[in-house]
Amino acid sequence: MAVTACQGLGFVVSLIGIAGIIAATCMDQWSTQDLYNNPVTAVFNYQGLWRSCVRESSGFTECRGYFTLLGLPAMLQAVRALMIVGIVLGAIGLLVSIFALKCIRIGSMEDSAKANMTLTSGIMFIVSGLCAIAGVSVFANMLVTNFWMSTANMYTGMGGMVQTVQTRYTFGAALFVGWVAGGLTLIGGVMMCIACRGLAPEETNYKAVSYHASGHSVAYKPGGFKASTGFGSNTKNKKIYDGGARTEDEVQSYPSKHDYV
């Protein structure tokens, strides 16, 4: 019962986490900047992974996708990649975990198979959560680094003076959503891995086969495989452990006339 609860809770927590990662990836508020308070209008700029938006005090908002910009920072591309990998792994993990849930019966699926699937999905959730946390942290680091580099820099360019506006960079809502979502996905993954231990059978039942030699004078058979399969020198009763998988040579269960002198 506790295993089912742990697995179910892990699934729900991961589901919420992955939904959060998707939401964070799509959000525009990764970084927010109080840009400029000039005599015309106050301007508020916020940027996401896919587009940049500017909002004026009048309420007018304009957003533009980054595809219009050449040479996007490598860090931004890395963050995009991490978030997408996180979403893809999380989505696959969710699919796998649905079939792994103990409360859902699919055909004659054994507990060992469900345990393996639970472990697989758990690992996927953990990696997904780590990807999201890493992505958000890389972006946050990029913001902090940019802030320290954006001291009012003035230079004269072709056709006038260009001044870097010193803006106050703040972490956008998407960063916090991403951190929390990544954490939830990670926790969900750990819970799935814990549930896996409870799902796995505690001991494997092996088929025991006892072989008896029919005579006292048993000839030594050099180099034969049968020395390891209960024949030849094995005159005493021994349990031979096999996992049910045998080669064609091992199918023979009883001594043949060729085994004896």
Partner: nanobody, 120 residues
Framework: QVQLVESGGGLVQPGGSLRLSCAAS????????MGWYRQAPGKGLELVAG???????NYADSVKGRFTISRDNAKNTLYLQMNSLRAEDTAVYYC??????????????WGQGTLVTVSS
Amino acid sequence: QVQLVESGGGLVQPGGSLRLSCAASGSIFHIPVMGWYRQAPGKGLELVAGISRGGTTNYADSVKGRFTISRDNAKNTLYLQMNSLRAEDTAVYYCNVLVVSGIGSTLEVWGQGTLVTVSS
């Protein structure tokens, strides 16, 4: 790198008209605000008129009703239509734009200035 090219300045008689233009080019993502400032001989810099991307405008009291600011967002170009010019409008007119050129890259760019002389 962002460049501004101003044009349209010159000598005009009182009561006459001029049209200034300012074209922005380079790595431009958003231009939230564009404006015209002027500096008369021996005086400080003052805002003449400004316009936001959304169409909000602001004019200096001394030019209200005489000057009209407009912008072409597609061409990233700013215009200032100056009518009923007076001798006190004589100044160097500077184009000023706020440019978002990328993530965390916000620039305030000033033009090289164009001289407007109102004299009979």
